[in-house]
Amino acid sequence: KSPIFGPEEVNSVEGNSVSITCYYPPTSVNRHTRKYWCRQGARGGCITLISSEGYVSSKYAGRANLTNFPENGTFVVNIAQLSQDDSGRYKCGLGINSRGLSFDVSLEVSQGPGLLNDTKVYTVDLGRTVTINCPFKTENAQKRKSLYKQIGLYPVLVIDSSGYVNPNYTGRIRLDIQGTGQLLFSVVINQLRLSDAGQYLCQAGDDSNSNKKNADLQVLKPEPELVYEDLRGSVTFHCALGPEVANVAKFLCRQSSGENCDVVVNTLGKRAPAFEGRILLNPQDKDGSFSVVITGLRKEDAGRYLCGAHSDGQLQEGSPIQAWQLFVNEESTIPRSPTVVKGVAGGSVAVLCPYNRKESKSIKYWCLWEGAQNGRCPLLVDSEGWVKAQYEGRLSLLEEPGNGTFTVILNQLTSRDAGFYWCLTNGDTLWRTTVEIKIIEGEPNLKVPGNVTAVLGETLKVPCHFPCKFSSYEKYWCKWNNTGCQALPSQDEGPSKAFVNCDENSRLVSLTLNLVTRADEGWYWCGVKQGHFYGETAAVYVAVEERKAAGSRDVSLAKADAAPDEKVLDSGFREIENKAIQDPRLFAEEKAVADTRDQADGSRASVDSGSSEEQGGSSR
């Protein structure tokens, strides 16, 4: 399939101009190769009319140009002074005309409307509102006012001042007579349909002295905006339908065969199953505008999308709409998703998130996709040291291993953690990948005590039991904080007795805290890794209390409390519910994200600038 994309149909009127944009994958070769616009002949050839190498056919001399925009991967053909002879089938393409790297475009140039003298032309978008103004003289001020539509040779009454409304206009038309000072009446038609287009006649009075005014109403079907995105990337549809529909249900639908438009998502809670986990409908602004983000684009997502407003939450005649034609380029560098990562209750997962490796300095984020409320993705953690309050002690985002991949570790898993998560950055918004966490049957591999209490000034030893399967892995203990997990010294105490059917290769590795202070209170993780690739982790909360009796504390598995189902947080922590991935434009002004965070979360830690080497192999 050709990766070149453009408008399938272009319609215009004699004398007007058109601008045709064609998209191509912006590879180095494509950016510099020849671009052309040619007309298809009856026998299958394609005659060049204009090219990027300076050629212009005599038919286009002085009225056309072709401009390449290599940085965007587009070129634009402008054609002026159109005539009906320009109607036909064309191709825009790259390279040689016959090579197949092209897109078929149909251009239809129609005759301009033959209008009567003194005709006012109203050009309005489908679904919108038109106000037809009808002047009259003083002598007709008290007489019947009416609007007719010319159907063939006959005028058909649409509305009049005695209260008549043509059934085709019921519920969407009114006739307003201005105050006595103004000799004008107006007819307002809402929710315009394509069938409303045509010639109208306003009339005040019914005799030979009546005042008449001709109006030509043109109802425009919205030209679809062309959207060219990479397979597995993201697309954002910004839908601005105007304040008059601010309180009406909104929808995004995809046109299937004929006039059908299948709802993708709407504000009434409907969502197509094919978009589960990969779509967000962002809350609308006061003016009624909203946006829809779809990530993990698939081949079958290509097509025509309409957004609109209607109380049913789906396309109906007269819905104001916006249109897009989405092309999905299969020559993509973005990895496939969703990745499915499996974890067990009580255990952990280490999720590897891809990002555009050109953007290593970008801020990394991880959010939980929620299907409720039309899809939203509240942030859970970022690479600047912010962690959502409910995830304190069990979630960390690490820049490692780097070079196009970052790591998110989540432990103390419960069935509530199952679901879709998004990996994203404040850089390339096309790189939003989904990962699905599944909670499967099984036991955590690492065994640690539940909550542990240390005594001020004493020594605390906390065990972590590693089964044989991790014999070839690095084992570590670290202290969790908002910016990562700082590595701590630990002791290998030899084989563990915590596993059945496990030989000398099992290990008991202990964390020792000497002369415990208040600063030692917090979450500690033991885990396994391979260089900068992180594996399983287990978390222990160490509380610190005043001395009761002398001696050091050695915590065993049996003596430990059961891990609490919920972590109880300080009153100093507040949930940041407003920190959600909504409008991706937010990332254009990073300050907006930072401000929300700083105001909402008093616990923000400063960012640790040291590399993992400087921190003695810590996880930051």
Epitope: T339, K342, P401, G402, G404, T405, Y534
Partner: nanobody, 116 residues
């Protein structure tokens, strides 16, 4: 779901080379980190090498560092392990794994035997 099939194993003399391949079926191969593990008779399965989705980062067990190279071709849904300077102690069944640091998806394994 990812299915993995290893190939390329066999009998080789010490100092020789082999190239293992792991072909993946399933739409999402290119988003997974991939790893190679090995299991010698009577021993635990041990880690050998891992590579990120884009090949941007790799890591090797000390025992194979400098001799083995992991690579991948996402267009072919395949991950490779180039094994040079083979030693008798490299004799094992070699397994390919998707998402090797969590609960991996495993292949069936391919036998590598290094004779002295």
């Amino acid at each position: 779901q990812v299915q993995l099939v290893e190939s390329g194993g066999g009998l080789v003399q010490a100092g020789g080379s082999l190239r293992l391949s792991c072909a993946a079926s399933g739409r999402t191969f290119s988003s997974y980190a991939m790893g190679w593990f090995r299991q010698a008779p009577g021993k635990e399965r041990e880690f050998a090498a891992v590579i990120t989705w884009n090949g941007g980062s790799t890591h090797y067990a000390d025992s194979v560092k400098g001799r083995f190279t992991i690579s991948r071709d996402n267009a072919k849904n395949t991950v490779y392990l180039q094994m040079n300077s083979l030693k008798p102690e490299d004799t094992a069944v070699y397994y390919c794994a998707a998402d090797p640091m969590n609960s991996p998806y495993w292949g069936q394994g391919t036998q590598v035997t290094v004779s002295s």
